[in-house]
């Protein structure tokens, strides 16, 4: 259902001071400027809806320009507790504490928040990414070391009058950016506490948050150029489907990935692409300005709606799932990587999806909204879309029930 009913004051409208407060690019994440401590230390922090810790570099590291120096903050409090976060690849570990935190281009408030001071890491910080920490915006259930560590956004809402909602507009450039261009470029907006009408077109459509851990949603149908993949919808959500700004690609469960690639290959068969392209290993290139977008299909994900037996669909273009990559060896061409990949942990709607849409994380009403982003990359023939309603039966059966184990996968 679209969201046109009246809202409480301050919930909607214009948030000029927060527009354009993100920088970065899909391949290395989007970051917001934050200040920590007294006097304030400025850091760039990755916006990650796929984790729940606020963690910042707090020791020298070859990939960090700067780091949080706790000894220089008069308001730092040590929690005398360590935290260790392993990933499938890599890890970070650090010491827990609290300090005063604010977002210069965010709400005009300062909150005392938990901070993990990262003292050691492996395969976490990215060379040239320009961020020094991570802001985990998901729920306490997946916080480390356990769910008693209050996430930043919970602290923000508790300590201020900021409504329990944020929204993200991630703007993919549509062309590769070099380091100086990234530093100068606008990457999008994180609107804390509300929705900015200028950032989207059309209507917002909402899907329920299935469970408050990750931002888990339910996909009920997948189409490639309007052709149904015709899989048992449980496969689309095996073992979960999440919205994750800290992941680059659209990641799909193995069976779904294989079916989707087969269908995309068939739709784009006028050109023969190497197997390595579909694996994300080989680039495909065309003479500058001649990328044949029209030969690639659109991809539609149908999401459970707010009303029984009702769904809506979000549709992305090849401009979202072919990621521009700069390579000096082929600099005369426009080159791309296939940004859909295989997952063993369920569907991850990463930057590839989010760059098409304005995404509202309405925690207060346990739902996620999608509208066409005012900054998405498209051509004169096709545009990303959010459309509905569609009648879909037995959508509850599409959810997969995970056997209970402690699980947290960040920045995969």
């Amino acid at each position: 259902e679209t969201d046109e009913e009246p809202e409480e004051p301050g919930r909607r409208g214009s948030f000029v001071e927060m527009v354009d407060n993100l920088r970065g690019k899909s391949g290395q994440g989007y970051y917001v400027e934050m200040t920590v401590g007294s006097p304030p230390q400025t850091l760039n922090i990755l916006v990650d809806t796929g984790s729940s810790n606020f963690a910042v570099g707090a020791a020298p590291h070859p990939f960090l320009h700067r780091y949080y120096q706790r000894q220089l903050s008069s308001t730092y409090r040590d929690l005398r507790k360590g935290v260790y976060v392993p990933y499938t690849q890599g890890k970070w570990e650090g010491e827990l504490g609290t300090d005063l935190v604010s977002i210069p281009h965010g709400p005009n408030v300062t909150v005392r928040a938990n901070i993990a001071a990262i003292t050691e890491s492996d395969k976490f910080f990215i060379n040239g990414s320009n961020w020094e920490g991570i802001l985990g915006l998901a729920y306490a259930e997946i916080a480390r070391p356990d769910d008693s560590l209050e996430p930043f956004f919970d602290s923000l809402v508790k300590q201020t009058h900021v409504p329990n909602l944020f929204s993200l507009q991630l703007c993919g450039a549509g062309f590769p950016l070099n380091q100086s261009e990234v530093l100068a470029s606008v990457g999008g907006s994180m609107i804390i506490g509300g929705i900015d009408h200028s950032l989207y077109t059309g209507s917002l459509w909402y899907t329920p948050i299935r469970r408050e851990w990750y931002y888990e949603v339910i996909i009920v149908r997948v189409e490639i150029n309007g052709q149904d993949l015709k899989m048992d919808c449980k496969e689309y959500n095996y073992d979960k489907s999440i919205v994750d700004s800290g992941t680059t690609n659209l990641r799909l469960p193995k069976k779904v990935f294989e079916a989707a690639v087969k269908s995309i290959k068939a739709a784009s068969s006028t050109e023969k692409f190497p197997d390595g392209f579909w694996l994300g290993e080989q680039l495909v290139c065309w003479q500058a300005g001649t990328t044949p977008w029209n030969i690639f299909p659109v991809i539609s994900l149908y999401l459970m709606g707010e009303v029984t037996n009702q769904s809506f669909r979000i549709t992305i273009l090849p401009q979202q799932y072919l990621r521009p990559v700069e390579d000096v060896a082929t600099s005369q061409d426009d080159c791309y990587k296939f940004a859909i990949s295989q997952s063993s942990t369920g569907t991850v709607m990463g930057a590839v999806i989010m760059e098409g849409f304005y995404v509202v994380f309405d925690r207060a009403r346990k739902r996620i909204g999608f509208a066409v982003s005012a900054c998405h990359v498209h051509d004169e023939f096709r545009t990303a879309a959010v459309e509905g309603p569609f009648v879909t039966l037995d959508m509850e059966d599409c959810g997969y029930n995970i056997p209970q184990t402690d699980e947290s996968t960040l920045m995969t």
Epitope: Q28, I126, N127, G128, K272, P274, Q282, L283, A329
Partner: antibody
Framework: EVQLQQSGPELVKPGASVKLSCKAS?????NFWIHWLKQRPGQGLEW???????????KYNQKFKAKATLTVDTSSSTTYMHLSSLTSEDSAVYYC?????????WGQRTLVTVSA | DIQMTQSQKFMSKSVGDRVSVTCKAS??????VAWYQQKSGQSPKSLIY???HRYSGVPDRFTGSGSGTDFTLTISNVQSEDLADYFC?????????FGGGTRLEIK
């Protein structure tokens, strides 16, 4: 400037193992896969396998699956190839190469000599 | 595995000549073929990708052509520094495979 710096020549005994390295610079390391190749006189170039530095995913030529193991250390932008149970057949020049379209960049070569 | 066959092992040309090095794939590889030059004691150098596209910095006397199964690298106005082995490679499917090479000698 993109560079792939390979480790120096190795003289090893039959049955032993060796670990070759390839340090990358001049580009975003996690954006491109690294491949390893073998060249023996009169036998042309053979593709051994490849690794994705962003997540350590590997894919091997079936012929080298029991011989080579590829690993990566992103903190130093270095890829490694471990060759085990060496025989005289493994005496060769080994290259690392970076993906893109095909292999636009190659390392400078590492000579491995297996001799008692 | 896809076989890449370079039937001519050696070619001898004079400076200023035009030379065509051929390569045949055992099955259709589209345009997913690259060409490399390797001088004695050195690493291969990338010349051509996607059958006919020159990598940045490669002199325009090197041109590639072909698709499907038959591919050609042409060097027009051969120079003495072109003395080298030339290899084709298919990157259409795994495992990636190379031709056996063609040695260009300068008379």
């Amino acid at each position: 400037e993109v560079q792939l710096q390979q480790s120096g020549p190795e003289l090893v005994k039959p049955g032993a193992s060796v670990k070759l390295s390839c340090k990358a610079s001049g580009y975003t390391f996690t954006n491109f896969w690294i491949h390893w190749l073998k060249q023996r006189p009169g036998q042309g170039l053979e593709w051994i396998g490849m690794i994705d530095p962003s997540d350590s995913y590997t894919k091997y030529n079936q012929k080298f699956k029991a011989k080579a193991t590829l690993t990566v250390d992103t903190s130093s932008s270095t890829t490694y190839m471990h060759l085990s149970s060496l025989t005289s057949e493994d005496s060769a020049v080994y290259y690392c190469a970076r993906s893109g379209v095909a292999f636009p960049y190659w390392g400078q070569r590492t000579l491995v000599t297996v001799s008692a | 595995d896809i076989q890449m066959t370079q039937s001519q092992k050696f070619m001898s040309k004079s400076v200023g000549d035009r030379v065509s090095v051929t390569c045949k794939a055992s099955q259709n590889v589209g345009s997913n073929v690259a060409w490399y030059q390797q001088k004695s004691g050195q690493s291969p150098k990338s010349l051509i990708y996607s059958a006919s596209h020159r990598y940045s910095g490669v002199p325009d006397r090197f041109t590639g052509s072909g698709s499907g199964t038959d591919f050609t690298l042409t060097i027009s106005n051969v120079q003495s520094e072109d003395l080298a082995d030339y290899f084709c490679q298919q990157y259409n499917s795994y495992p990636y495979t190379f031709g056996g090479g063609t040695r260009l000698e300068i008379k």
